[in-house]
C-alpha cells in the first residue's frame, strides 16, 4: 500500500472521523432549516461541501473507486454520498436555469445520517428487505384493485354525473343549450339543486332505489363529476383511484354515499366486499409481511 492509502485507511477507521462527519451532517441539517439564511451561511455551505468531498476522497483512496469488490461505488450507501457531492458542485458552479429545483437535492444530505449511525442502518436495511418481500403482496393488491376497478367501471361509469336539474327554463333554453354554456359555479347553482353548504350538486339516479330529486327538479346526466371531477368511475384509472381510496378508507363513506345515491342501494354489496377484502384482509396482509421481514432481520 502507498503511504497516501495507509493514511487514508487510518483516517477512515478512526472514531473521530465518524464523529466529525456525523456532527457535520447534523449541523448542515440545522442550517437547512433556516428560513432566511444570512449571507455568511454561503461560506458555511462551502465548508460542508468541502468536508463531504474530503470524506469521499478518503474513502476512495482507502478502498478504491469502483474496480474491486469492496470499493467505494460497490457500497450503495456511498452512492448517496456521491450524488450529494455531485449536486453540491452542480448547483454551485453550473448555471442550470431553475436552480431551486436542483437545490432540493440538498435535503439528501440529511439521509447521510443513516449511513453513519449503525442502528439506523440496520433498521433501514430491514425496511428495504421488507419492501422486497412485499412485492408478491403488492402484485396481489394491485391485481385485486384492478379487478374491482373494472367491476366498478362497468357498474358505475358516468353515474356520478347524475344531477338534479331545474324544471323551469327560458323560452330559448333547452338541455343541450345549457350543457354547452355551463362554465362558472354561478351557472351550476342556477340550474342544479344544491344542499345547504354543499359544494356539489345533489346526486340522483334513474333506478327506483337510487336518490330522487326534490320537487321542481329532474335527474339528468350533465356536467362534471363531484369533488372537482376527481371522484368518478368513468375511466379505469379513476376507478382504480376510487378503489384505492376504499382500501385505505380515506373518507370512503362519502364515496359510498355518493355512489349509492347515484346507482342505487343494492350496490352496497360491492362496497361490503371491497371493504372486507381490500381494507381488512389486504392491508393486514401487508402489515404481516412487514412484521415478518423485521423479525427475520432481527434474527
Amino acid at each position: 500500500f502507498s503511504p497516501l492509502r495507509r493514511i487514508s485507511i487510518k483516517i477512515l477507521v478512526h472514531s473521530l472521523f465518524s464523529m466529525l462527519i456525523m456532527c457535520t451532517i447534523l449541523t448542515n441539517c440545522i442550517f437547512m432549516t433556516m428560513n432566511n439564511p444570512p449571507d455568511w451561511t454561503k461560506n458555511v455551505e462551502y465548508t460542508f461541501t468541502g468536508i463531504y468531498t474530503f470524506e469521499s476522497l478518503v474513502k476512495i483512496l482507502a478502498r478504491g473507486f469502483c474496480v474491486g469488490e469492496f470499493t467505494f461505488l460497490r457500497d450503495p450507501w456511498n452512492w448517496l454520498d456521491f450524488v450529494v457531492i455531485v449536486f453540491a458542485y452542480l448547483t454551485e458552479f453550473v448555471n442550470l436555469g431553475n436552480v431551486s429545483a436542483l437545490r432540493t437535492f440538498r435535503v439528501l444530505r440529511a439521509l447521510k445520517t443513516i449511513s453513519v449511525i449503525p442502528g439506523l442502518k440496520t433498521i433501514v436495511g430491514a425496511l428495504i428487505q421488507s419492501v422486497k418481500k412485499l412485492s408478491d403482496v403488492m402484485i396481489l393488491t394491485v391485481f385485486c384493485l384492478s379487478v374491482f376497478a373494472l367491476i366498478g367501471l362497468q357498474l358505475f361509469m358516468g353515474n356520478l354525473k347524475h344531477k338534479c336539474f331545474r324544471n323551469s327554463l327560458e323560452n330559448n333554453e333547452t338541455l343541450e343549450s345549457i350543457m354547452n354554456t355551463l362554465e362558472s359555479e354561478e351557472d351550476f347553482r342556477k340550474y342544479f339543486y344544491y344542499l345547504e353548504g354543499s359544494k356539489d350538486a345533489l346526486l340522483c339516479g334513474f333506478s327506483t332505489d337510487s336518490g330522487q330529486c326534490p320537487e321542481g327538479y329532474t335527474c339528468v346526466k350533465i356536467g362534471r363529476n363531484p369533488d372537482y371531477g376527481y371522484t368518478s368511475f368513468d375511466t379505469f384509472s379513476w376507478a382504480f383511484l376510487a378503489l384505492f381510496r376504499l382500501m385505505t378508507q380515506d373518507y370512503w363513506e362519502n364515496l359510498y354515499q355518493q355512489t349509492l345515491r347515484a346507482a342505487g342501494k343494492t350496490y352496497m354489496i360491492f362496497f361490503v366486499v371491497v371493504i372486507f377484502l381490500g381494507s381488512f384482509y389486504l392491508i393486514n396482509l401487508i402489515l404481516a409481511v412487514v412484521a415478518m421481514a423485521y423479525e427475520e432481520q432481527n434474527q
Epitope: M157, L175, F206, T218
Partner: nanobody, 124 residues
Framework: EVQLVESGGGVVQPGGSLRLSCAAS?????????TGWYRQAPGKQRELVAR???????QYADSVKGRFTISRDNAKKTVYLQMNSLRPEDTALYYC?????????????????WGQGTLVTVSS
C-alpha cells in the same frame, strides 16, 4: 338510433283545429326534463311553441297562448298538442323535442332528441 314518432299534421282551414302527437315509446327514453313542440316556418328560425315538464307544468309561446294546449300521457309516453283557432301564420314544420335522458344500454346520456317533423299547413 333514438326515434320520436310524430303524427297529426296536415292541411286545415283558418279557424280549424289539429291534434299533434309525439310518441317516445322506445325503452331508450328514460326521463325527460320536458317534451315540447317547436316549429320552423320557411325562411325563419326554429321557435318554441309549447312544452310540458315532467311534473306537468307547461310553457307556451306568446303567439299561441289561449289557442294551443299541450298535454301528456305518461303511461303511453306520448305528448299531445291540441291546436285550435289556427291561423295562416301557424303554417310550419312542427318538431317534437325530447329534452332529457336516454339509455344507450351501456350508459345514460342526457341531451336534446328531435323528431323528424310533421307539416301543418293553414290555408283557405
Amino acid at each position: 338510433e333514438v326515434q320520436l314518432v310524430e303524427s297529426g299534421g296536415g292541411v286545415v282551414q283558418p279557424g280549424g283545429s289539429l291534434r299533434l302527437s309525439c310518441a317516445a315509446s322506445s325503452r331508450q327514453f328514460i326521463r325527460d326534463v320536458f317534451t315540447g313542440w317547436y316549429r320552423q316556418a320557411p325562411g325563419k328560425q326554429r321557435e318554441l311553441v309549447a312544452r310540458i315538464y315532467n311534473e306537468g307544468n307547461t310553457q307556451y309561446a306568446d303567439s299561441v297562448k289561449g289557442r294551443f294546449t299541450i298535454s301528456r300521457d305518461n303511461a303511453k309516453k306520448t305528448v299531445y298538442l291540441q291546436m285550435n283557432s289556427l291561423r295562416p301564420e301557424d303554417t310550419a314544420l312542427y318538431y317534437c323535442l325530447f329534452s332529457g335522458t336516454i339509455s344507450t344500454g351501456r350508459e345514460y346520456r342526457s341531451g336534446d332528441y328531435w323528431g323528424q317533423g310533421t307539416l301543418v299547413t293553414v290555408s283557405s
